[in-house]
């Protein structure tokens, strides 16, 4: 039975030209995290593999930095970066857990972080 939950930074906003940290945390499970994939729609941003380290997609190499931890830092933000981001935790033996973050990139300098909140996990087995 999958007992884990993913906590994310939730709905967040940031200023155009600035940077933002995307962060997820898996809790309430003893499953081993083998890999974390970061995606925007169907585009891969990065993978953090427990054995092999980080792979940043070539499309994002110049403005995505690994970390902190299993999180991801997006730099040089544009309004086109507005949208949904997903952290996909591949675990053993549980399977996959997925967290969602919505990022809004604002033209103004009034960008504020949304409250940290917990979302129900959804998952599938490979």
């Amino acid at each position: 039975m999958m007992t884990g939950t993913i906590e994310t930074t939730g709905n967040i906003s940031a200023e155009k030209g600035g940077s933002i940290i995307l962060q997820c945390h898996l809790s309430s499970t003893t499953a081993q995290v083998t890999q974390v994939n970061w995606e925007q729609q169907d585009q891969l941003l990065a993978i953090c593999n427990a054995d092999l380290g980080w792979h940043i997609s070539p499309s994002f190499k110049d403005r995505v930095a690994p970390g902190p931890g299993l999180g991801l830092t997006l730099q040089s933000l544009t309004v086109n970066d507005t949208g949904e981001y997903f952290c996909i935790y591949h675990t053993y033996p549980d399977g996959t857990y997925t967290g969602r973050i919505f990022l809004e990139v604002l033209e103004s300098s009034v960008a504020e972080h949304g409250a940290r909140f917990q979302i129900p996990h959804h998952h599938h087995h490979h």
């Epitope: 169907d42 585009q43 891969l44 993978i47 054995d51 980080w54 792979h55 499309s59 599938h124």
Partner: antibody, heavy 120, light 106 residues
Framework: EVQLQESGPGLVKPSETLSLTCAVS????????WNWIRQPPGKKLEYIGY???????YYNPSLKSRVTISRDTSKNQFSLKLSSVTAADTAVYYC??????????????WGQGTTVTVSS | DIVMTQSPDSLAVSLGERATINCRAS??????IAWYQQKPGQSPKLLIY??SYRYTGVPRFSGSGSGTDFTLTISSLQAEDVAVYYC?????????FGGGTKVEIK
Amino acid sequence: EVQLQESGPGLVKPSETLSLTCAVSGYSMTSDYWNWIRQPPGKKLEYIGYISYSGRTYYNPSLKSRVTISRDTSKNQFSLKLSSVTAADTAVYYCARGDYSNYGGAMYDWGQGTTVTVSS
Amino acid sequence: DIVMTQSPDSLAVSLGERATINCRASQGVSTTIAWYQQKPGQSPKLLIYSASYRYTGVPRFSGSGSGTDFTLTISSLQAEDVAVYYCQQYYSSPFTFGGGTKVEIK
């Protein structure tokens, strides 16, 4: 130029252990990750597993109970052992190199492959 | 495991014409796709990684797609392109390959 060269017996008896070695030249095994892939006659490529630059291993769950991948950095080579073989393990076995940081799971330097037949 | 299905199984194309090979994943794999060329009696050679990025020194070949559907295109088929082409996903372990598409000259 990086070269990978597989070696080992071409014929293995059923129930015995298949042992192959991949010699790496022109590059140090202390970075990147090092893979084994096989291709049974007329079938698709099957991923066996890897050993990382730090010595950590991953094995395909379908073979996990029978596979061991190890390395000898002093000789710049890594090895595959597959126990309790059957005719279904007859295949061309390839070793290959991957650079996870730049190419993810895409493998870009391959050995020429060695054919292993399991038969009594 | 993620199942990769290629189509067609074989393809005959005239020299200088375009060849298109399709690959479908059993679940979304984002852009974590590689394409390989395997000529008779040789080992596979990497052509494309991250779905659309050409590996060093690879001409004529292009890749596209994301999610579950991917395409490898040879813009103008040459005699030396006769080979079997494989897609591979590395979204999750174990990495898995398609069944291959054989490209021949018509």
